[in-house]
């Protein structure tokens, strides 16, 4: 069927449109285009005879039309009047006529719109504002944007005049935004420049900062006032009703009790004509005395003495506060406060109780702190440590031993060799030692204040040759996948190489094996049952090479998931049921059985003679390793059939 397609359907003024013909019949004589929905000679635009290829303009021809051999019609430089229907009249060679009608619409190209406003400075909660999108254009749609978002739903927003007018009733400061309008028709869309709504508001009730109203004599008073307002507010200060100054800040240095009173800030908006005030009452206090701490014991002895710290002076109706190490008091049974909090007692002082301690007196306004007090706790001496830790030295070297014991006051030291006093120094030095210098070296630490003494004895062997080493371990029964084990090769000696073997082989490369302390310590991280091997350490120096006896690591593991044997699950009635449970575990696990959830016996083997179908059910074996604290279990279903009913069943002997 003959049809006309308009490309485009909506045409902008000044552009062109093509009336495209589809399904044009064969064997044509000619065709004519008419303005309108029917063939009307007065409204003929153009005719075309195929045989002569001659185009003849009609009465409605404007000079902007071009006809094509395929009967399509191009209309250029479109005007508004071109809107409407167009009819093609086709005359076939057999002189039979055929008609088709097409149409298009013409729209103007829209200009860039602008916004007009009936009120450039509306007042909050009082005025309305009407924005109008200019110009008024026929067949145009009007849209509005606020801060580049479509209009929010609000009872205070109203569109009218075909959406051309946007009215904001009872404007608020939150309506201060960027407004744009947009005009649209089928051929164009244009957006206006933004218009910023300047809402006049305030002043709100002013806020005075800082908030504190209590001051100490001698301080500076610095008050600041702020009220939300557009345009910004003008500020005035009044003290006890008397005008002071027209500034946002009020500053009074070195205040006295006489500066106590009511301070008023007034905020004024010249555009809205509104005033708001806020009043704060300022109280100036005279300076209280600075507190200080007294102690009943300036040199307490650790674990023996108690100390009472008292906050002075005593003032009626005063709150006393305490701090230790700049923190509030920790909860401790060794710390006691008196009823009025003025006395802090430390029961059985320790070296960690040195402080510093501070007390404070709280008045209406602030807290006055005392100077910090540090306790001189007398302690020690602790057991002395002798360094270095070597026990073997080679002949000819210098022996330099140092002794240290934690002590207050610092300890006085004495050295003894084989029980004979040598010198009263912290360090012992013997040059060019020989085997005759082997012996028991004792360091004695003495605290003259507490009168306590402690000693440490160290065996020193002077020998070019090292003894047979031994291995010490920090964990004799490590748990698999949990514990680490550190083996240490003894003794510790100078200029010594330490070596390690596992099962007679040199150490394997493993991220779980780590050598430290000059290879003297071998650490196995996250031990596994495969680490249960023989470990040997070796020591080598200039004249000796010796190996330790092997130490076998006893790794506790499991229990693994148990296995119930035999694997059969089907039995004949009358057979004996003999189930054995096994789980890899070190030490061997404890076994127990449950049938259908009911505890049975604590044995590795479960035996039931002459079973019947009543013995059907779930058989669970539970294993537990008390050493690892771990448990495991497995469940097996047993089916007992009446004799001879099911082939291939186990006799279950």
């Amino acid at each position: 069927k003959l049809t006309i397609e308009s490309t485009p359907f909506n045409v902008a003024e000044g552009k062109e449109v093509l009336l495209l013909v589809h399904n044009l019949p064969q064997h044509l004589f000619g065709y004519s285009w008419y303005k309108g929905e029917r063939v009307d000679g007065n409204r003929q635009i153009i005719g075309y005879v195929i045989g002569t290829q001659q185009a003849t303009p009609g009465p409605a021809y404007s000079g902007r039309e071009i006809i094509y051999p395929n009967a399509s019609l191009l209309i250029q430089n479109i005007i508004q009047n071109d809107t409407g229907f167009y009819t093609l009249h086709v005359i076939k060679s057999d002189l039979v006529n055929e008609e088709a009608t097409g149409q298009f619409r013409v729209y103007p190209e829209l200009p860039k719109p602008s916004i007009s406003s009936n009120n450039s400075k509306p007042v909050e909660d009082k005025d309305a504002v009407a924005f109008t999108c200019e110009p008024e254009t026929q067949d145009a749609t009007y849209l509005w944007w606020v801060n580049n978002q479509s209009l929010p739903v609000s009872p205070r927003l109203q569109l009218s005049n075909g959406n051309r007018t946007l009215t904001l009733f009872n404007v608020t400061r939150n309506d201060t935004a960027s407004y744009k309008c947009e005009t649209q028709n089928p051929v164009s869309a244009r957006r206006s420049d933004s218009v910023i709504l300047n809402v006049l508001y305030g002043p709100d009730a002013p806020t005075i900062s800082p908030l504190n109203t209590s001051y100490r004599s001698g301080e500076n008073l610095n008050l600041s006032c702020h009220a939300a307002s557009n345009p910004p507010a003008q500020y005035s200060w009044f003290v006890n009703g008397t005008f002071q100054q027209s500034t946002q800040e009020l500053f009074i240095p070195n205040i006295t009790v006489n500066n106590s009173g009511s301070y008023t800030c007034q905020a004024h908006n010249s555009d809205t004509g509104l005033n708001r005030t806020t009043v704060t009452t300022i109280t100036v206090y005279a300076e209280p005395p600075k507190p200080f701490i007294t102690s009943n014991n300036s040199n307490p002895v650790e674990d023996e003495d108690a100390v009472a710290l008292t906050c002075e002076p005593e003032i009626q109706n005063t709150t006393y506060l305490w701090w230790v190490n700049n923190q509030s008091l920790p909860v401790s049974p060794r710390l006691q406060l008196s009823n009025d909090n003025r006395t802090l007692t430390l029961l059985s002082v320790t070296r960690n109780d040195v402080g510093p301690y501070e007390c404070g007196i709280q008045n209406e306004l602030s807290v006055d702190h005392s100077d910090p007090v540090i306790l001189n706790v007398l302690y020690g001496p602790d057991d002395p440590t002798i360094s270095p830790s070597y026990t073997y030295y080679r002949p000819g070297v210098n022996l330099s031993l140092s002794c240290h014991a934690a002590s207050n006051p610092p300890a006085q030291y004495s050295w003894l060799i084989d029980g004979n006093i040598q010198q009263h120094t912290q360090e012992l030095f013997i040059s060019n030692i020989t085997e005759k210098n082997s012996g028991l070296y004792t360091c004695q630490a003495n605290n003259s204040a507490s009168g306590h003494s402690r000693t440490t004895v160290k065996t020193i062997t002077v020998s070019a040759e090292l003894p047979k080493p031994s291995i010490s371990s920090n964990n004799s029964k490590p748990v698999e996948d949990k514990d680490a084990v550190a083996f240490t090769c003894e003794p510790e000696a100078q200029n010594t190489t330490y070596l390690w073997w596992v099962n007679g082989q040199s150490l394997p490369v493993s991220p779980r094996l780590q050598l430290s302390n000059g290879n003297r310590t071998l650490t196995l991280f996250n031990v596994t049952r495969n680490d249960a091997r023989a470990y040997v350490c070796g020591i080598q120096n200039s004249v000796s090479a010796n190996r330790s006896d092997p130490v076998t690591l006893d790794v506790l593991y499991g229990p693994d998931t148990p296995i119930i044997s035999p694997p059969d699950s089907s039995y004949l009635s009358g057979a004996n049921l003999n189930l054995s449970c096994h789980s890899a575990s070190n030490p061997s696990p404890q076994y127990s059985w449950r049938i259908n959830g009911i505890p049975q016996q604590h044995t590795q083997v479960l035996f039931i003679a002459k079973i019947t179908p009543n013995n059907n059910g779930t058989y669970a074996c539970f294993v537990s390793n008390l050493a690892t604290g771990r448990n495991n279990s497995i469940v097996k279903s047993i089916t007992v059939s009446a004799s001879g009913t099911s082939p291939g069943l186990s006799a279950g002997a």
Partner: antibody, heavy 120, light 106 residues
Framework: EVQLQQSGPGLVRPSQTLSLTCTAS????????MHWVRQPPGRGLEWIGW????????EYAPKFRGRVTMLADTSKNQFSLRLSSVTAADTAVYYC?????????????WGQGTLVTVSS | DIQMTQSPSSLSASVGDRVTITCSAS?????MHWYQQKPGKAPKLWIY???NLASGVPSRFSGSGSGTDYTFTISSLQPEDIATYYC?????????FGQGTKLEIK
């Protein structure tokens, strides 16, 4: 295979310096202490001293101090003995010697020995 | 210096005999070590740290002792055991050897 190969002159003039070198193979001298021992003809063994090639530390028998020097060249894996102002009493077979861990076992290795005769 | 006194300085024994050599130190030592030396050869470590047999040493050899007095024993003398045996202390410098015990077959 661990080996100690000695080299040096078999004849040294009195008052001159005896100089012997020991080249090690099969192990790194830097990891061990290297000793020198001598044995005068028909007599017993006499320890001269050791050197730690890693840092050059030495320990000499008092009898030889003042005229003995031990040196090591770790890049060549060799060490040497120098004994100055020799006399006929220094005529002996000189051995280089090391005590090392060969795998799991502590092993004792000796050079083949060099007979040094002090004579004019 | 620690003096090492070995005795006897030589001894003659028959194949299968039990042979004992003693070594006395002038001061206490940690361990005693024993070397075997055959004519024209370098010494070989035979027993280390008083009682440990060096690699390849037959079990008929043994060592014992402590402090200043140590013993070297062959439970059943064999022809291949003919050599000079030296004791050595390594406890203090200088390291010192005994004067040696020459072992011969009768």
């Amino acid at each position: 295979e661990v080996q100690l190969q000695q080299s040096g002159p078999g004849l040294v003039r009195p008052s001159q310096t005896l100089s012997l070198t020991c080249t090690a193979s099969g192990f790194n001298i830097k990891d061990n202490y290297m000793h020198w021992v001598r044995q005068p003809p028909g007599r017993g063994l006499e320890w001269i001293g050791w050197i730690d090639p890693e840092n050059g530390d030495t320990e000499y028998a008092p009898k030889f101090r003042g005229r003995v020097t031990m040196l090591a060249d770790t890049s060549k894996n060799q060490f040497s003995l120098r004994l100055s102002s020799v006399t006929a009493a220094d005529t002996a077979v000189y051995y280089c010697h090391v005590l090392i861990y060969a795998g799991y076992l502590a092993m004792d290795y000796w050079g083949q020995g060099t007979l040094v005769t002090v004579s004019s | 210096d620690i003096q090492m006194t070995q005795s006897p300085s030589s001894l003659s024994a028959s194949v299968g005999d039990r042979v004992t050599i003693t070594c006395s130190a002038s001061s206490s030592v940690t361990y005693m070590h024993w070397y075997q030396q055959k004519p024209g050869k370098a010494p070989k470590l035979w027993i280390y740290s008083t009682s440990n047999l060096a690699s390849g040493v037959p079990s008929r050899f043994s060592g014992s002792g402590s402090g200043t007095d140590y013993t070297f024993t062959i439970s059943s003398l064999q022809p291949e055991d003919i050599a000079t045996y030296y004791c050595q202390q390594r406890s203090t410098y200088p390291l010192t050897f005994g004067q040696g015990t020459k072992l011969e077959i009768k």
